[in-house]
């Protein structure tokens, strides 16, 4: 059963100090979004018992395994049904607590009734404040039965429920007609799914014989032990003030478990802690009684004394529940009540026994649930005990259940049942998830859903390059953290698989399904530098750059040019998609702007180091284009250009710039200045014969203006090869301005 306890503090008469606490001893309980366990829930259930609405109750989480409900403002807030839900998956369990008002008209003689299928249940409501009116019994909020007030027997109204079946389970209440529901007596009826001492789907299996008031669970045959007892059969008492399946929890406060009601998973229900009784769990057990609700009687023999928490305390030389067994009778010592092994393992189980005559190897045997008897392979004999070691054959799931160690000597015999849980190692149902990747590393989330049993103790990540036959690399990681696979090859596919393990030998599960994860490209390492740049217009900039010479192929797909306009806080990015390019024309820039310029190599999505930045000032926007540009060949080396001045000039032209380029040529164009702005014609000399040229021009005031239309003209034939074009204006010959 799930280790889940709901505690109600009944000692506090002030409702504002009242609290309910739900404590889980389950591994990973209450961790909420954690993949290994949903959260603990603690709430009031108003579906059956409606009370006047009040301020909302406050829920406080104390670590991962405890949740407390507070904020009760008046006694009526306490009346009704509370539930705590804990455990994961198929083990998710609801524990229910029913609170009765101490001042109610009717009070339950006993709140929780656990009965077997087919039994007769009798609910008894004791008259606390009499009303001469009918008593209404309800089941789960619906009308169930009516009693005339004269039908009270010995100050009690009884509801007999013959031949109960599991659907009869639920919350029952007895209420005087036309009275407040807060004055009702509330009961909880739990009907086990089987007859007494039986469990399992067809109720074919025999219960282990739960001791000290433990109740056999009808689904799994486990004993749900009362608070203060532990062990497969609840045979062992906890120290005073402790509870939980392994006695791992401690009652709060100085008076231990006094005034606390403990509610455990069905079919146990609720009771006082061990050593206490009464409707408020504040009365110590009467002499001779012990256990939860003081329901057990000691009946100690041979000088044993009764302890109200643990039962008989035996004098030297005697043992047994009632001190009825002499120490001469052999006795199994310190046998764990529950052992856990992994499927297909071959564990060694030890069983120690003492007695007089002394037990020998052959006198100790181990019996499996199917009745198979194992004999020990070796025995260690010590002065006070013999320890037999059993080599268990490969475990299968059917080996889960109650095993028994038995010792027999001429002095008698003893046996001890213990539970063996055969667990299935966890197997991932899904592949791990890629979170981020770089050229030499992958960041992976190993958390996946799994089949089999938890808890997960380790997660192994196996990986190797795709289609490789080399050994897998393995990394062991924390279950709850992401993993970084390092020192990988760039631009390489890796097959990655998860392997989960649970505690214990053989706890490693099979590998999960593979997934392909690919590393990124290698980072480009070369740093370009800017060779130069020149302004081709008020909004155009031609940039050139170089790369260092290194052996081997160039690692890069292209270049990224960045222009930063600090005034406006804007960045312009230009992608040059050829790694061979060393020049680029940037257009659409803002005239009169100061830019910071750099260039960097890129590869896939990765950027290399940026070049040292350059600072470029674009001139302000210039004048309109010259009009009606016309070209006329004069000879085999001369062409005359004529034009008209631009219209609507913002100021006096300082010069004209002529661009000359051989038609269809691949080289850069040549720029020639015409420094006499009043001229409207010029002769370009030094051209090659029989060659077709393209011309365009623009004016400059403070900055260069727009280009004119482009004109074509061919020089005349049969000339010699010229040295290169020069220009001559009508007034005087000028040198070439490059």
């Amino acid at each position: 059963a799930v280790d889940l306890t709901l505690l109600a503090n009944l000692r506090l008469t002030d409702p504002q100090r009242f609290f309910l606490t739900c404590v889980s001893g389950e591994a990973g309980a209450g961790r909420g979004s954690d993949a290994w366990g949903p959260p603990l829930l603690l709430e009031k259930d108003d579906r059956i018992v409606r009370t006047p609405p009040g301020p909302p109750l406050r829920l406080a989480r104390n670590g991962s395994h405890q949740v407390t409900l507070r904020g009760f403002s008046k006694p009526s807030d306490l009346v009704g049904v509370f539930s705590c839900v804990g455990g994961a998956g198929a083990r998710r369990t609801r524990v229910i607590y029913v609170h009765n008002s101490p001042g109610a008209h009717l009070l339950p003689d006993k709140v929780t009734h656990t009965v077997n299928k087919g039994d007769t249940a009798v609910l008894s409501a004791r008259v606390h404040k009499e009303k001469q009116t009918d008593v209404i019994w309800k089941s789960n909020g619906s009308y169930f039965y009516t009693l005339d007030w004269h039908e009270a027997q010995d100050g009690r109204f009884l509801l007999q429920l013959p031949n109960v079946q599991p659907p009869s389970s639920g919350i029952y209440s007895a209420t005087y007609l036309e009275a407040s529901p807060l004055g009702s007596a509330f009961f909880r009826l739990i009907v086990r799914g089987c007859g007494a001492g039986r469990w399992g789907p067809g109720c074919t299996k025999e219960c282990p014989g739960c001791l000290h008031g433990g109740v056999c669970h009808d689904h799994d045959g486990e004993c749900v032990c009362p608070p203060g007892f532990t062990g497969t059969r609840c045979e062992q008492a906890c120290r005073e003030g402790r509870f939980g399946q392994s006695c791992q929890e401690q009652c709060p406060g100085i008076s231990g478990c006094r005034g606390l009601t403990f509610c455990l998973p069905d079919p146990y229900g609720c009771s006082c802690g061990s050593g206490w009784r009464g409707s408020q769990c504040q009365e110590a057990c009467a002499p001779g009684h012990f256990g939860a609700d003081c329901r057990l009687q000691c009946q100690c023999q041979n000088g044993g004394t009764c302890d109200r928490f643990s039962g008989c305390v035996c004098p030297s030389g005697w043992h047994g529940v009632h001190c009825e067994k002499s120490d001469r009778i052999p006795q199994i010592l310190n046998m764990a009540s529950e052992l856990e092994f992994n499927l297909e393992t071959m564990p060694r189980i030890n069983c120690a026994a003492a007695g007089n005559p002394f037990p020998v190897r052959g006198s100790i045997e181990l019996r499996k649930p199917d009745g198979t008897v194992l004999l020990s392979t070796k025995a260690i004999v010590e002065p006070e005990k013999t320890t037999a070691e059993f080599e268990v054959p490969r475990l299968v799931l059917a080996d889960s259940g109650f095993w028994e160690c038995r010792v027999s000597t001429s002095g008698g015999q003893d046996s001890r049942r213990f539970k063996v849980n055969v667990k299935v190692p966890p197997v991932p149902l899904a592949a791990p998830r890629l979170l981020t990747k770089q050229s030499r590393q992958l960041v992976v989330s190993p958390l996946v859903s799994f089949s089999g049993d938890g808890p997960i103790s380790t997660v192994r990540l196996h990986y190797r390059p795709q289609d490789s036959t080399m050994d897998w690399s393995t990394i062991v990681v924390d279950p709850s953290e992401n993993v970084t696979l390092m020192n990988l090859r760039p631009k390489t596919g890796y097959s990655v698989r998860v392997q989960l393990s649970r505690p214990g030998e053989g706890g490693e599960g099979a590998w999960g399904p593979p997934t392909l994860m690919t590393t990124d490209c290698p980072e480009p390492l070369l740093q370009p530098w800017l060779e130069g740049w020149h302004v081709e217009g008020t909004d155009r900039l031609r940039v050139s750059w170089s790369l260092p010479l290194v052996p081997g192929p160039l690692v890069g797909d292209g270049f990224l040019l960045r222009l930063w306009d600090g005034t406006r806080g804007q960045e312009r990015r230009e992608n040059v998609s050829s790694p061979q390019a060393r020049t680029a024309l940037l257009t659409g820039l803002t005239p009169g702007t100061h830019y910071q310029l750099d260039v960097q190599l890129y590869h896939c999505t990765l950027l290399g180091p940026a070049s040292p930045p350059a600072h470029v000032l674009l001139p302000p926007s210039g004048p309109p284009a010259p009009r009606h540009l016309h070209a006329q060949a004069l000879s085999d080396s001369e062409i005359q250009l004529t034009w008209k001045h631009p219209e609507a000039l913002p100021g006096p032209i300082s010069k004209y710039v002529v661009e000359v380029q051989v038609a269809g040529g691949a080289g850069d164009p040549l720029w020639i200045d015409v420094d006499r702005p009043e001229e409207t014609s010029t002769i370009i000399r030094g051209l090659n014969a029989s060659t077709r040229y393209l011309f365009r021009m623009r004016a400059s005031i403070q900055g260069l203006g727009d280009w004119s239309n482009t004109v074509e003209e061919s020089t005349l034939g049969n000339g010699l090869q010229a040295e290169g074009p020069v220009q001559e204006s009508r007034a005087a010959e000028e040198g070439l301005d490059q």
Partner: antibody
Framework: EVQLLESGGGLVQPGGSLRLSCAAS????????MLWVRQAPGKGLEWVSV????????YYADSVKGRFTISRDNSKNTLYLQMNSLRAEDTAVYYC????????????????WGKGTTVTVSS | QSVLTQPPSVSVAPGQTATITCGGN??????VHWYQQKPGQAPVFVYD??DRPSGIPERFSGSNSGNTATMTISRVEAGDEADYYC???????????FGSGTKVTVL
């Protein structure tokens, strides 16, 4: 479907006797309080008698006390009203009804009624 | 034993509101139930001062305090024409006391 069906009514002379039956179906009869209500021609409703689920406790209106007896047979899901020493003023339509308590509340009301059977006391 | 007094008749035009009263000593301390009976039919439980059974229109409402309980039928329809009885339970001798009945006529 929850149903109540009365029978046994008829014409009877003053001083005579009559036994009414009410057959219940569609619910667990043994859990419910049952009662008889009558309605004289042109008059209002008048409660006659009630019986508890166990059958152990019964109550009567003053007008019929000592003359009428209510009883039930839970194994047959049937309610009875034995009427002796009948008088002219007992002439009425007799209804049987189921007494129930709603969820969340604690009061009685009659949620299911039969169609009624007519008793005429006349010489 | 309780005595419950109702007006013999109430007339109301369609779409208007009909109010039926039920007087009784300290009736406000009891649960009052209302039954509707159409000619030739058995009574039907329609309302009490806590609740309305499923299938009964929201037009039926009520209140109860002091010495008078009231049932109100708003937006009266022709189908609401019937006799209406109030009823209380008296624990003394397990008495089920009905009012004298009120005939509601829809004009």
């Amino acid at each position: 479907e929850v149903q109540l069906l009365e029978s046994g009514g008829g014409l009877v002379q003053p001083g005579g006797s009559l036994r009414l039956s009410c057959a219940a179906s569609g619910f667990t009869f043994s859990k419910y309080k049952m009662l008889w209500v009558r309605q004289a021609p042109g008059k209002g409703l008048e409660w006659v008698s009630v019986i508890y689920p166990s059958g152990g406790y019964t109550y009567y209106a003053d007008s019929v006390k000592g003359r009428f007896t209510i009883s039930r047979d839970n194994s047959k899901n049937t309610l009875y009203l034995q009427m002796n020493s009948l008088r002219a003023e007992d002439t009425a339509v007799y209804y049987c009804a189921r007494v129930v308590v709603p969820a969340f509340y604690y009061y009685y009301y009659m949620d299911v009624w039969g169609k009624g059977t007519t008793v005429t006391v006349s010489s | 034993q309780s005595v419950l007094t109702q007006p013999p008749s109430v007339s109301v035009a369609p779409g208007q509101t009909a109010t039926i009263t039920c007087g009784g000593n300290n009736i406000g301390t009891k649960s009052v139930h209302w039954y509707q009976q159409k000619p030739g039919q058995a009574p039907v439980f329609v309302y009490d001062d806590n609740d309305r059974p499923s299938g009964i229109p929201e037009r039926f409402s009520g209140s109860n305090s002091g010495n008078t309980a009231t049932m109100t039928i708003s937006r009266v329809e022709a189908g609401d024409e019937a006799d209406y009885y109030c009823q209380v339970w008296d624990p003394t001798g397990d008495q089920y006391v009905f009012g004298s009945g009120t005939k509601v006529t829809v004009l």
